[in-house]
């Protein structure tokens, strides 16, 4: 059966979310990658994407989001700086592979941003640092819009997963900007 797993990040306003999406296969290194938010009842929305082809260690900044693709490690680093309460939600990384539909990277990120003191977090297991320096040179990339008219769409079910969920951190699936409804046996 398909595993839809997510990992929970609980942060304070003003802190930085700093996560990595593992894309496993070298063939994906140059593929364009994107950071999306999945809001209840809506289609996944692309917030930022890398260039096409994706460049190694080259920061791309869109507003408060910085993407950096590390080909040598098979990882896409995503940072969201100066977090706001309204940033709370479910996020995912995807890989664009035209003419094929995009691939989704796991884990999904369940971000919970709360008001309060945004000093150095106390728990190493459950938090990220809030200190962040803007990269000296960043590029803004244009993100393609993928649609699949014949795809039935629906927001994915809300998961009850939390940090104790086994993490399938590098699992891939075929999705589009309009996500396919998975069929479970």
């Amino acid at each position: 059966a398909t595993k839809l797993t997510e990992e929970k990040y609980e942060l304070k306003e003003g802190q930085t979310l700093d996560v990595k999406c593992d894309y496993t296969l070298e063939k994906f290194a140059s593929s364009q990658k994107a950071w999306q938010i999945i809001r209840d009842g809506e289609m996944p929305k692309t917030l930022a994407c890398t260039e096409r082809p994706s460049k190694n260690s080259h920061p791309v900044q869109v507003g408060r989001i910085i993407l950096e693709d590390y080909h040598d490690h098979g990882l896409l680093r995503v940072r969201m700086v100066n977090l706001q309460v309204e940033d709370s939600g479910l996020y995912q990384c995807v890989i664009y592979q035209p003419p094929k539909e995009p691939h989704m990277l796991f884990d999904r990120i369940r971000l919970v941003v709360t008001k309060g003191f945004s000093g150095t977090p106390g728990s190493n297991e459950n938090s990220t640092q809030n200190v962040y320096k803007i990269p000296p040179t960043t590029t803004k990339a244009l993100c393609p819009l993928y649609t699949s008219p014949r795809t039935v769409t629906q927001a994915p079910p809300k998961s009850t997963a939390d940090v104790s969920t086994p993490d399938s951190e590098i699992n891939l699936t075929n999705v589009t900007d309009i996500i396919r409804v998975p069929v479970f046996n």
Epitope: M104, E125, T128, P166
Partner: antibody, heavy 117, light 111 residues
Framework: EVQLVESGGALVKPGGSLRLSCAAS????????IHWVRQAPGKGLEWVGR????????KYAPKVKGRFTISADDSKNTAYLQMNSLKTEDTAVYYC??????????WGQGTLVTVSS | EIVLTQSPATLSLSPGERATLSCRAS??????????LNWYQQKPGQAPRLLIY???YRGRGIPARFSGSGSGTDFTLTISSLEPEDFAVYYC?????????FGQGTKVEIK
């Protein structure tokens, strides 16, 4: 050239503590994950845990959770394994490894930890 | 946690022969068409070396005589023609679920 060098291995008594270091060169640890893997004498490999040095987020094997703590100092490009309440069964060569595409691709030479009274 | 069982424990072969090593997982390590199963080689006194990742892809600088296959719970590492330097211990490892786990190893020794 990518290199990982572990240090800090020693002989320690049961119940004691030890901190291992893993110094990286040739890449920035903040751009990847660092894992610790151990190997008891004459035995197989055992994953200990992992850190995302940029975010500080950690994962541990159940056997060491609560006793071992993985940390990292981005500015020193070094990861650490703090081991408390050591047991004789923690005796092993400890390797730090760099992550690449879902695997542990870059390995250090290992450092020996002996827990004995 | 996912338990990986390797077989045989020891494989006695001569240089030039074909080696087939098996790794079985207690539950599937495949998802969305990718198998999160890796193979490592370890020689005495040395650190392990990545051979195969994601079940079938060779690591950097790994000779073509090494190949991997399988999905779900059953995986195979094949060495098409053993070279003298291939006699070592081989471990499978899954990166599908935390904690990551290794098989107990298969020793490939000279017959």
């Amino acid at each position: 050239e990518v290199q990982l060098v572990e240090s800090g291995g020693a002989l320690v008594k049961p119940g004691g503590s030890l901190r291992l270091s893993c110094a990286a060169s040739g890449f920035n640890i903040g751009n990847t994950y660092i894992h610790w893997v151990r190997q008891a004498p004459g035995k197989g490999l055992e994953w200990v845990g992992r850190i995302d040095p940029a975010g500080g987020r950690t994962k541990y094997a159940p056997k060491v959770k609560g006793r071992f703590t993985i940390s990292a100092d981005d500015s020193k490009n070094t990861a650490y394994l703090q081991m408390n309440s050591l047991k004789t069964e923690d005796t092993a060569v400890y390797y730090c490894t760099g992550h690449r595409g879902g695997t542990m691709d870059y390995w250090g030479q290992g450092t020996l930890v002996t827990v004995s009274s | 946690e996912i338990v990986l069982t390797q077989s045989p424990a020891t494989l006695s072969l001569s240089p030039g022969e074909r080696a087939t090593l098996s790794c079985r997982a207690s539950q599937s390590v495949s998802n969305y068409g990718i198998s999160f199963l890796n193979w490592y080689q370890q020689k005495p006194g040395q650190a392990p070396r990545l051979l195969i990742y994601a079940a079938e892809y060779r690591g950097r600088g790994i000779p073509a005589r090494f190949s991997g296959s399988g999905s779900g719970t059953d995986f195979t590492l094949t060495i098409s023609s053993l070279e003298p330097e291939d006699f070592a211990v081989y471990y499978c490892q899954q990166s599908s679920n935390v904690p990551y786990t290794f098989g107990q190893g298969t020793k490939v020794e000279i017959k």
